[in-house]
């Protein structure tokens, strides 16, 4: 989350979360000085895992299971900020930020998931998208990968062009100042977004044991 | 019941063009991702192209990228193959085949249609 | 990609024999595989999915195991339909490849 309340409760990890922070802390180990490709490092991630048994697994998804129970247990007694729910001033008109692989690849399955599983919440829904996703290969990923690319260098252009124009007049002055803090804006933007994107997928409403759709 | 049924086969002319169909019915066809699979005379099975549920991603073995485009209606629950420049190795009966996934994520194929032989020949 | 390789290619059996065919992939695949029947002038028929899962309608006499890249079909006790060809199959990644086949005979 990034900004907000510092007494918010940690969000609750996936038991593929744990595996790759468990794999960052053994690369990290091994490589104390070597710098991580991220996306290197994601895909032999994703690859490791595809290829765990359910005994290996097992040992993440308990984590999982105990630190959802630690959310579940803060939750309950934390109480947020007055006006914590008024989200700050978007610009209507603003490029709309291009959706990631996983969201393309979510916008695909979901319809089927949700189909076949009319009683499941939207966060089973989104957690079953997540163990699809991280038990898809590499190069089953590539066409999500290439087309999120795409509209990633789209929004670039359009944001750039946005941006040339003027925003609202409210956002006009102070624009030496406005170029300084640019960079630090552009990432603040990039963490608020992925959140916006969760958000959405949540909207939206967000395995079989078999496919039971078969009429 | 869940059923595969491919058509549009023939003889063709090296460098020629044909498109096949598959009707698929019995089944939510929008939910599921679709593949081609073919079969040589007398030789084994070989992978073609897959296509995503809405249609909007595809994938090719290296042997037909650039000459065959897959695509699918999803109103008229039909998938298609449009193969252009044939050659003689083509030639093969062509499955078309439902991907399924168990609850650990594992696709596998089923049902497949009976197949529609091409035969690129002069 | 990846290199499925079966053997032996083709098997002489009598009805009620134990038979084993066996699958190997150039990688490893977890337990990304799956076990095809084909009977000439037919279309496969999914028999084993994930490497050990009986596919629903088919005889318990088949069965399947493996990981990694060593993968088993074992058929317990031959049956007069079992005479056909049978195919490995990884679903690990595109391109999805098929194991050569193996061709069940009888004696």
């Known amino acids: 989350m990034g900004k907000g309340d510092p007494k918010k409760p940690r969000g609750k990890m996936s038991s593929y979360a744990f595996f790759v922070q468990t794999c960052r802390e053994e690369h990290k180990k091994k490589h104390p000085d070597a710098s991580v490709n991220f996306s290197e490092f994601s895909k032999k991630c994703s690859e490791r895992w595809k290829t765990m048994s359910a005994k290996e697994k097992g040992k993440f998804e308990d984590m999982a299971k105990a630190d959802k129970a630690r959310y579940e247990r803060e939750m309950k007694t934390y109480i947020p900020p007055k006006g914590e729910t008024k989200k700050k001033f978007k610009d209507p008109n603003a490029p709309k930020r291009p959706p990631s692989a996983f969201f393309l690849f979510c916008s695909e399955y979901r319809p089927k998931i949700k189909g076949e599983h009319p009683g499941l919440s939207i966060g089973d829904v989104a957690k079953k998208l997540g163990e699809m996703w991280n038990n898809t290969a590499a190069d089953d990923k590539q066409p999500y990968e290439k087309k999120a690319a795409k509209l990633k260098e789209k929004y670039e252009k359009d944001i750039a062009a946005y941006r040339a124009k003027g925003k609202p007049d409210a956002a006009k002055k102070g624009v030496v100042k406005a170029e300084k803090s640019k960079k630090k804006k552009e990432e603040e933007e990039d963490e608020e977004d992925e959140e916006d994107e969760e958000e959405e997928e949540d909207e939206e409403d967000e395995d079989e044991e078999e496919d039971d759709d078969d009429e | 019941e869940v059923q595969l049924l491919e058509s549009g086969g023939g003889l063709v002319q090296p460098g020629g063009s044909l498109r096949l169909s598959c009707a698929a019915s019995g089944f939510t066809f929008s939910y599921y991702d679709m593949h081609w699979v073919r079969q040589a005379p007398g030789k084994g099975l070989e992978w073609v192209s897959r296509i995503s549920p809405s249609g909007g991603y595809t994938w090719y073995a290296d042997s037909v990228k650039g000459r065959f485009t897959i695509s699918r209606d999803n109103s008229k629950n039909t998938l298609y193959l449009q193969m252009n420049s044939l050659r003689a190795e083509d030639t093969a009966v062509y499955y078309c085949?439902?991907?399924?996934?168990?609850?650990?994520?594992?696709?596998?194929?089923?049902?497949w249609g009976q197949g529609t032989l091409v035969t690129v020949s002069s | 990609d990846i290199q499925m390789t079966q053997s032996p290619s083709s098997l002489s059996a009598s009805v009620g024999d134990r038979v084993t065919i066996t699958c190997r992939a150039s990688?490893?695949?977890?337990?990304?595989l799956n076990w095809y029947q084909q009977k000439p002038g037919t279309a496969p028929k999914v028999l084993i999915y994930a490497a050990s899962s009986l596919q629903s309608g088919v005889p318990s006499r088949f069965s399947g195991s493996g990981s990694g890249t060593d993968f088993t079909l074992t058929i317990s006790s031959l049956q007069p339909e079992d005479f056909s060809t049978y195919y490995c199959?990884?679903?690990?990644?595109?391109?999805?490849?098929f194991g050569q086949g193996t061709k069940l005979e009888i004696k």
């Open positions: 085949t439902r991907g399924r996934y168990t609850s650990g994520w594992h696709e596998y194929f089923d049902p």
């Open positions: 199959q990884q679903s690990y990644n595109t391109p999805r490849t």
């Open positions: 990688q490893s695949i977890g337990t990304y």
